[in-house]
């Protein structure tokens, strides 16, 4: 759920990393209400995810590692 560029809530679904091409961090102290990770999928979707959840942190690390290796 997002309003303009801000996530207002989190997805209930767990995304597989193979469908995710990148992510953006949303910070509550930078104009939005909540902290979030916005995953960008191969189908050009933006999905708001809870940065506290294990699967979210795991994928963020996988993607960060890919960027470093490029």
């Amino acid at each position: 759920a997002s309003n303009f560029d801000c996530c207002l809530g989190y997805t209930d679904r767990i995304l597989h990393p193979k469908f995710i091409v990148g992510f953006t961090r949303q910070l509550a102290n930078e104009g939005c209400d909540i902290n979030a990770i916005i995953f960008h999928t191969k189908k050009k979707l933006s999905v708001c995810a809870n940065p506290k959840q294990t699967w979210v942190k795991y994928i963020v690390r996988l993607l960060s590692k890919k960027v470093k290796n490029m």
Partner: antibody, heavy 124, light 107 residues
């Protein structure tokens, strides 16, 4: 109750590889992160990496990034840790451990189930 | 990556003593900290998770506190079975990192 059963002790030559297994029984496997932690004789604990079996890809500590490969077989509920280019400094006990909560839960709840450890000795 | 500095490395104490072990993170980790106890030849055992929550089955003489960068593990009245090595672990972010350990010995 979940148990993690690890493979037996190994003696390896320098330059070779070792593959340690960790079989889960009595609970869900695919949606829990499995970590690998090693402990050299008389030393502290060192996190090597982790894998969520359903995701397949492993996350690694930078120190081990180039030498360790974590895999998981969902059909047998078994996780594997392969370490290559062994040296005497890799002589250690290798533990697998499972997160307390599945990957949909909040992180930070610790690893509550541990294997007994696998002793790997690297010697010429 | 987040570094965890644990102190002291060694601690001598007597049965009945109150002891405190500290762990400091190189950056803020909220409350994403766990404490483990390890005895020789055994796997680590989870004592405290989320900085202050007691793992099921762990005696209430163990307690944890702290948030951000500074954390403590307290044993209110040492028992003979508590002499072991204790480790903190941050799981705020990958890679996970352990503190260097505190060996608690009988005085």
């Amino acid at each position: 109750e979940v148990q993690l059963v690890q493979s037996g002790a190994e003696v390896k030559k320098p330059g070779s590889s070792v593959k340690v297994s960790c079989k889960a029984s009595g609970g869900t496997f695919s949606s829990y992160a499995i970590s690998w932690v090693r402990q050299a004789p008389g030393q502290g604990l060192e996190w090597m990496g982790g894998i969520i079996p359903m995701f397949g890809a492993g996350n690694y500590a930078p120190k081990f990034q180039d030498r360790v490969t974590l895999t998981a077989d969902e059909s047998t509920s078994t996780a594997y840790m392969e370490l290559s280019s062994l040296t005497s400094e890799d002589t250690a006990v290798y533990f697998c451990a499972r997160d307390s909560t599945d990957f949909s839960g909040d992180s930070g709840l610790g690893m509550d189930v541990w294997g007994r450890g696998t002793m790997v000795t690297v010697s010429s | 990556d987040i570094q965890m500095t644990q102190s002291p490395s060694f601690l001598s104490a007597s049965v009945g003593d109150r002891v405190t072990i500290t762990c400091r993170a190189s950056q803020g980790i909220n409350n994403y900290l766990a404490w483990y106890q390890q005895k020789p030849g055994r796997a680590p055992k989870l004592l405290i998770y989320a900085a202050s929550s007691l793992q099921s089955g762990v005696p209430s003489r163990f307690s944890g506190s702290g948030s951000g960068t500074d954390f403590t593990l307290t044993i209110s009245s040492l028992q003979p079975e508590d002499f072991a090595t204790y480790y903190c672990l941050q799981d705020s972010d990958y890679p996970l990192t352990f503190g260097g350990g505190t060996k608690l010995e009988i005085k």
